[in-house]
Interface confidence: low
């Protein structure tokens, strides 16, 4: 049967109902169980076996084509015979304390081998020894506070920082810039232990021996450190390790709060600068350097023996060919590799993707194909720097930039069970608002109400009254290459915690051995109703993007966002009124471009309302204008010092990879500008960045004009 035909025997809305109805909580639960029986560390046999299993099941589900896509990338592992640890040594060099070599296995998992001990992936080897300095979250502002206000130097010191607030790679980068020779990362109870909740296995809190694994790279979107910009295939030229992108230069190691207590309890030096530096341990949180009083002769020593290795990784790529527009790709992707069991990250997401694939496959078996092609991806090595997704996108960049309609990310489905959390391009705001109005809320107290209703009540927008919050895309997940490098409209959705009452960073057991199937079933989502809701949201996004006659993108939402971002960056700049005047810095051109974009977007929407949708050429023209609008914000030259972050409106914050920054070029040029030695040069760069932003917004507006 020709595949470029139609979309099934029911209407768009009927077909969507059927698709959504096919999604079952019980299946997601079953898939999660299946995906969490063993560890699935990237580059290991277990993860290859899971890739093959998913490949086979996606074929059974009815996808047209499923392939394994492999790359040989730089990964990092601890040395099995030479474990990593940190010790306190006395003046004679004897170890008087050693941190744990591993986490205690959770009940029922005592006999499982292959549990990788806690480590910081890509840490170099080394045995630095010295005084400790406590640097809070190791944010840029924390180091400013230490160095500028407290006059404490980290040069030649080992720094200890608590996880939370920012991406750990940024923490390490900041420590390196401050001159540290080693870094210890730990989980503080203030950030990873919610009061009145028990520790695992009796609750969902982090026990004292629990440790967060994670990579400490600063790739800035490069992908495999040895093949930046190009796929790590057999033909690839590989840099020498000394020229690899983003590797840390100092040894780094993570520990739990029981071990941190021992390292911090005798810290000397000044008290923390303010209470925001105090965590939840019974220690003074003195900054150091070094220990106090009788302990002043003791030092801290790191013992890091991890190694890097070029290792084969495997993505699973499934294709469901579009009936009418097979050359337009809607991508749903999430990673498969886990630090250990991956009960939440990533398998709560992978299980949802699996069920979405099954539902689309069921429709296809009934002859109901999507209008556009849907690509499904099970990415490998996300935990090692988004490597699987980035290498695949690098390999297929020419196709993706020409044909990519949208990318929907599908990592962890839950990080809590309070309300929905969405980050996406403004193009998708309307899509998300509309589809959540059609879904039932799973929340207690919202029976019979829509997901939109519970979401807006629990997470209201700070700008728009009566609407739910949607956040900017940052990074730290597999949408990065699609959005920040290629300019493909992207979005993500998951269920989250109550950020107002629950101050923990992420969820307490994140990247620990205790992130198990039982954690989810016992404490987060016993009935899997939240997983089902996330499946419905992600699935409906993909469904609409793949089946709507007119792409469900709203360029006017982008106009509103651009105005807000221009106001924000202008207000930041206006904190320096004298310099603005002296160096003749004006935002008039940017505001003019934004106004023009707003006008053009409005006219475009008017034409869209009047579009003769029965004319396939006219329809394709306007759909292409919508599809390519995100692409229009890409600058081929990239952002300063970050060539793979090419989106001019959004980039991961230079200070926190997880967070999105608007007008990042201007923001970075303005950041800490008052401390720059050469003010004239600094303000000239602000001027240059304003001109780039102005040109980009103006150029993007031009793409929305009537074609002739």
């Amino acid at each position: 049967k020709p595949s470029n035909e139609a979309t099934g025997n029911v209407s768009h809305s009927g077909m969507k109902k059927e698709f959504l109805h096919e999604l079952k909580a019980e299946n997601i639960k079953k898939f999660l169980y299946n995906f969490t029986r063993t560890p699935h560390l990237a580059g290991t046999q277990n993860n290859f076996e899971l890739a093959k299993q998913i490949h086979d099941q996606w074929k059974e589900f009815g996808l047209d084509l499923v392939e394994l896509s492999h790359y040989d990338v730089l990964l990092s592992y601890p040395n099995k015979t030479h474990p990593n640890y940190i010790s306190i040594i006395n003046e004679d060099g004897n170890e008087i304390f050693k941190t744990s070599l591993s986490e205690q296995p959770p009940p029922g998992y005592e006999n499982i081998s292959d549990v990788v001990p806690p480590y910081s992936a890509f840490s170099p080897q080394g045995t630095p020894e010295g005084d400790l300095v406590y640097v809070n979250y190791a944010r840029t502002e924390d180091f400013f506070k230490l160095e500028r206000e407290m006059k404490i130097s980290c040069s030649g010191k080992i720094v200890i920082a608590r996880y939370g607030k920012v991406f750990r790679g940024n923490m390490v980068k900041n420590a390196q810039l401050a001159g540290a020779k080693g870094m210890i990362l730990y989980s503080d109870p203030a950030d990873y232990f919610v009061p009145a909740v028990k520790s695992y296995p009796d609750g969902w809190n982090l026990p004292g021996g629990g440790v967060q694994r994670g990579n400490v790279l600063n790739l800035n979107g490069a992908g495999d450190p040895l093949t930046p910009g190009y796929p790590a295939n057999e033909h690839a030229y590989r840099h020498e390790l000394t020229n690899a992108v983003g590797l840390p230069s100092i040894p780094v190691h993570p520990i739990g709060y029981d071990d941190a207590q021992k390292l911090l309890e005798h810290m000397g030096g000044p008290a923390p600068p303010d209470s925001s530096w105090k965590g939840g341990l019974k220690v003074p949180y003195n900054v150091g350097p070094g220990f106090a009083g009788n302990f002043s002769t003791q030092k801290v020593k790191m013992h890091i023996h991890s190694y890097t290795k070029v290792t084969r990784i495997y993505n699973v790529i499934g294709t469901l060919k579009g009936a009418l527009e097979p050359d337009r790709y809607v991508i749903l992707g999430g990673h498969r590799d886990a630090w250990v069991f991956g009960g939440i990250d990533p398998q709560s997401g992978a299980a949802v993707v699996h069920e979405i694939v099954r539902s689309f496959g069921t429709l296809k078996k009934k002859g109901r194909r999507p209008r556009r092609t849907i690509l499904f991806a099970s990415w490998d090595a996300e935990e090692f720097g988004l490597l699987g997704s980035t290498e695949w996108a690098e390999e297929h960049s020419r196709l993706l930039q020409e044909r990519g309609v949208a990318y929907i990310n599908a990592d962890s489905s839950i990080e809590g069970n309070y309300t929905l959390r969405v980050d996406c391009t403004p193009l998708m705001y309307s899509l998300v608002y509309n589809l959540t109005k059609e879904l039932q809320s799973p929340d207690e107290g919202f029976e019979g109400k829509s997901l939109y209703d519970s979401w807006k009540e629990k997470s209201p927008s700070p700008e728009f009254i009566g609407m739910p919050r949607i956040s900017k895309l940052g990074s730290g997940n597999d949408f990065e290459v699609f959005f920040q490098r290629l300019g493909i409209a992207s979005g993500r959705a998951r269920y989250t915690k109550n950020w107002k009452t629950n101050k923990v960073s992420s969820y307490p057991l994140y990247h620990s051995v205790y992130e198990t199937y039982e954690l989810v079933v016992k404490f987060y989502d016993p009935t899997f109703k939240y997983h089902l809701t996330v499946a419905q949201v992600r699935g409906a996004m993909v469904f609409e993007l793949a089946n709507s006659i007119v792409l469900p993108f709203d360029c006017q939402s982008y106009a509103v966002a651009l105005k807000k971002y221009a106001d924000t960056i202008y207000n930041i700049s206006m904190k320096h009124p004298q310099e603005m005047k002296a160096y003749m810095i004006s935002f008039d051109s940017l505001f003019s471009a934004v106004n023009n974009f707003t006008d053009v977007a409005s006219k475009f929407n008017q034409r869209l309302q009047e579009l003769d949708k029965s004319n396939p050429i006219l329809l394709r023209i306007m759909n292409d204008q919508l599809m390519y609008l995100e692409r229009a914000f890409i600058d081929p030259l990239g952002l300063p010092g970050r060539p793979f972050y090419r989106h001019i409106i959004y980039a991961p914050s230079s200070h926190n990879k997880y967070a999105g920054e608007s007008f990042p070029g201007i923001y970075d040029a303005l950041f800490d500008i008052s401390s720059k030695v050469n003010a004239s040069k600094a303000w000239n760069e602000v001027k240059r960045q304003i001109s780039i932003a102005t040109f980009t917004v103006q150029a993007a507006a031009e793409t929305l004009r009537e074609v002739a």
């Epitope: 049967k1 139609a6 209407s11 009927g14 009934k366 006659i549 003769d612 949708k613």
Partner: antibody, heavy 123, light 108 residues
Framework: QVQLQESGPGLVKPSETLSLTCTVS??????????WGWIRQTPGRGLEWIGT???????YYNPSLRSRLTLNMDTSKQEFTLRLTSVTAADSAVYYC???????????????WGQGTQVTVSS | DVVMTQSPATLSLPPGERATLSCRAS??????LAWYQQKPGQAPRLLIY???TRATGIPARFSGSGSGTEFTLTISSLQSEDLAVYYC??????????FGGGTKLEIK
């Protein structure tokens, strides 16, 4: 009530293009949410679905006719058209314009039929 | 394509009798099946959709049953105006939507 009325030439020469129009009265394309299609009937082949359209412009074609078939809709005139190129004697049939049961039931059963128009392909 | 086969090709019964018309699909079409009645010189008319749901205005003597591949249209008590050709049509798997070849119902 809703009515469908087919119109077009009763006689078409081989290799030429058959154009038929269906005028819909009593219902608006754009607000009704129905799917509209064409079916033909010959004594030899019985009833044969040709294709279907939605007001938004979605078109659904019988693969056997796909290369020769174009369906269009003019919402302002409340009519939809069939164009079948390179006709042969095998295209001689009674052509019905139809409405699928609905609204929003998609390509379901056909609940409304025009009275049909006989098309003969002959030189 | 899903091939729909109807039997018998012709059915001849006296008024008041029960008529049973069969339709078989070459593969499962679930309950996505419709029945039509076409009287001489007229367009077809929808009788049943969803295998068993009567369309608006259709007399209760017409009933449909079956699912998967085997379907039946039953006319409980034949009347003279039921003289017609009856077609089944599947709308589960497409394109194309396909019809059966028809059963001609004659009144003795």
């Amino acid at each position: 009530q809703v009515q469908l009325q087919e119109s077009g030439p009763g006689l078409v020469k081989p290799s030429e293009t058959l154009s038929l129009t269906c005028t819909v009265s009593g219902a608006s394309f754009s607000s009704s949410g129905y799917y509209w299609g064409w079916i033909r009937q010959t004594p030899g082949r019985g009833l044969e679905w040709i294709g279907t359209m939605f007001y938004s412009g979605a078109t659904y074609y019988n693969p056997s006719l796909r290369s020769r078939l174009t369906l269009n809709m003019d919402t302002s005139k409340q009519e939809f058209t069939l164009r079948l190129t390179s006709v042969t004697a095998a295209d001689s049939a009674v052509y019905y314009c139809v409405r699928h049961r609905g609204p929003d039931s998609g390509l379901d059963a056909f609940d409304l039929w025009g009275q049909g128009t006989q098309v003969t392909v002959s030189s | 394509d899903v091939v729909m086969t109807q039997s018998p090709a012709t059915l001849s019964l006296p008024p008041g009798e029960r008529a049973t018309l069969s339709c078989r699909a070459s593969q499962s079409v679930s309950s996505y099946l419709a029945w039509y009645q076409q009287k001489p010189g007229q367009a077809p008319r929808l009788l049943i959709y969803g295998a068993s749901t009567r369309a608006t205005g259709i007399p209760a003597r017409f009933s449909g049953s079956g699912s998967g591949t085997e379907f039946t249209l039953t006319i409980s008590s034949l009347q003279s105006e039921d003289l017609a050709v009856y077609y089944c049509q599947q709308y589960n798997d497409w394109p194309p939507l396909t019809f059966g070849g028809g059963t001609k119902l004659e009144i003795k």
